[in-house]
């Protein structure tokens, strides 16, 4: 059922999440700025083709427009989301020593994000049985494969917390 | 409510490996990420790494990337650190801290578990 | 990797007296989100650290208001306003801006 914003959310699980959302955007954009300084990768339209051939996907929100926003839907798809970038951030490991210490606080702040959503689902009543199982991930074969995954995954995250944030603003509006 | 309990006290010889456990109950442990800390006698704490149970990803202080081996089992709710090459300078009590954000960080310890390396 | 460090290591407080505890980190611990990621753990003789303080200034469950926590990006202070025989033990701040976490050295706080 669509529900405005008025919803049963606390207002204290809201704000941890825009805090999150805005923390890991820091992250996001920290590894965007380096795999730019230091491999000239700066812009995410130029590797469209080679993500499709990399096959990175997306994760949808479709459930979460905030005229007909569904909060289960919502919930989960915000989770499940946030478990696919757990996994392809994963497949980025060892990208690079510089670009390392970086990643790993993104992965960690994505896991934690992915664990306050899980949590005000189960208090809800809405938490799946059990976690759903990690899709196929992307095979990098080259470090430069790897570097451009980079780019990619980083753009489509931020591309994802954004409309996460606009979701949970509408949300958190009295 | 959220209880980590740790397995026991180890004496091992150097040059030995060592496995200490850390089940935890009263929360859906998938969850979760799992943290290791070192404190060795008389100094303070270290943060060693975690397990994301979830997706099986472990993460490591550079310093420990060679000591240490983080896994978890979420059918039995248990997360392991394995020691591996013991030294004397591995004697220290181990504990496992429960993730999370804001005041989840860190909210629920283990117990510790003693490991002491001596010939 | 991100250095924190406290003063004093070992600070005797007469009970009902106030006490203070310092500690600086060597790269601010605000994000740009508004948070300050500074952490303030007790480890009381014999036990497992708990945790006092998250975010800078927010008191955790169950800890008494007399314990308060302030500070900029870098410079944190931890107050007990009249300190009671139970608050001895090793305190600790800690960040978790940024892996890997990193803790203070401990301020070990006793009874006159």
């Known amino acids: 059922t669509p529900l405005g914003p008025a919803s049963s959310l606390p207002q204290s699980f809201l704000l941890k999440c825009l805090e999150q959302v805005r923390k890991i955007q820091g992250d996001g954009a920290a590894l965007q700025e380096k795999l730019c300084a230091t491999y000239k990768l700066c812009h995410p339209e130029e590797l469209v083709l080679l993500g499709h051939s990399l096959g990175i996907p997306w994760a949808p929100l479709s459930s979460c427009p905030s005229q007909a926003l569904q909060l289960a839907g919502c919930l989960s798809q915000l989770h499940s989301g946030l478990f696919l970038y757990q996994g392809l951030l994963q497949a980025l490991e060892g990208i690079s020593p510089e670009l390392g210490p970086t990643l790993d606080t993104l992965q960690l702040d994505v896991a934690d994000f992915a664990t306050t959503i899980w949590q005000q689902m189960e208090e809800l009543g809405m938490a799946p049985a059990l976690q759903p199982t990690q899709g196929a991930m992307p095979a990098f074969a080259s470090a430069f494969q790897r570097r451009a995954g980079g780019v990619l995954v980083a753009s489509h995250l931020q591309s994802f917390l954004e409309v996460s944030y606009r979701v949970l603003r509408h949300l958190a509006q009295p | 409510q959220v209880h980590l309990v740790q397995s026991g006290a180890e004496v091992k010889k150097p040059g030995a490996s060592v496995k200490v456990s850390c089940k935890a109950s009263g929360y859906t442990f998938p969850i979760y990420t799992m943290h290791w800390i070192k404190q060795a006698p008389g100094q303070g704490l270290e943060w060693i790494g975690y397990i994301n149970p979830s997706i099986g990803y472990a993460n490591y202080n550079q310093k420990f990337r060679d000591k240490a081996t983080l896994t978890a089992d979420k059918s039995t709710s248990t997360a392991y650190m394995e020691l591996s090459s013991l030294r004397s300078e591995d004697t220290a009590v181990y504990y496992c801290?429960?993730?999370?954000?804001?005041?989840?960080?860190?909210?629920?310890w283990g117990q510790g578990t003693l490991v002491t390396v001596s010939s | 990797d991100i250095v924190m460090t406290q003063s004093p290591l070992s600070l005797p407080v007469t009970p009902g007296e106030p006490a203070s505890i310092s500690c600086r980190s060597s790269?601010?611990?605000?994000?740009?989100?508004?948070?300050?990621?500074l952490y303030w753990y007790l480890q009381k003789p014999g036990q497992s650290p708990q945790l006092l303080i998250y975010?800078?200034?927010n008191l955790a469950s169950g800890v008494p208001d007399r314990f308060s926590s302030s500070g900029s990006g870098t410079d944190f202070t931890l107050k007990i306003s009249r300190v009671e025989a139970e608050d001895v033990g090793v305190y600790y701040c800690a960040q978790n801006l940024e892996l890997p976490y990193t803790f203070g050295q401990g301020t070990k706080l006793e009874i006159k």
């Open positions: 790269k601010s611990l605000l994000h740009s989100n508004g948070i300050t990621y």
């Open positions: 975010q800078m200034s």
């Open positions: 801290a429960r993730g999370g954000y804001g005041d989840s960080l860190f909210a629920y």
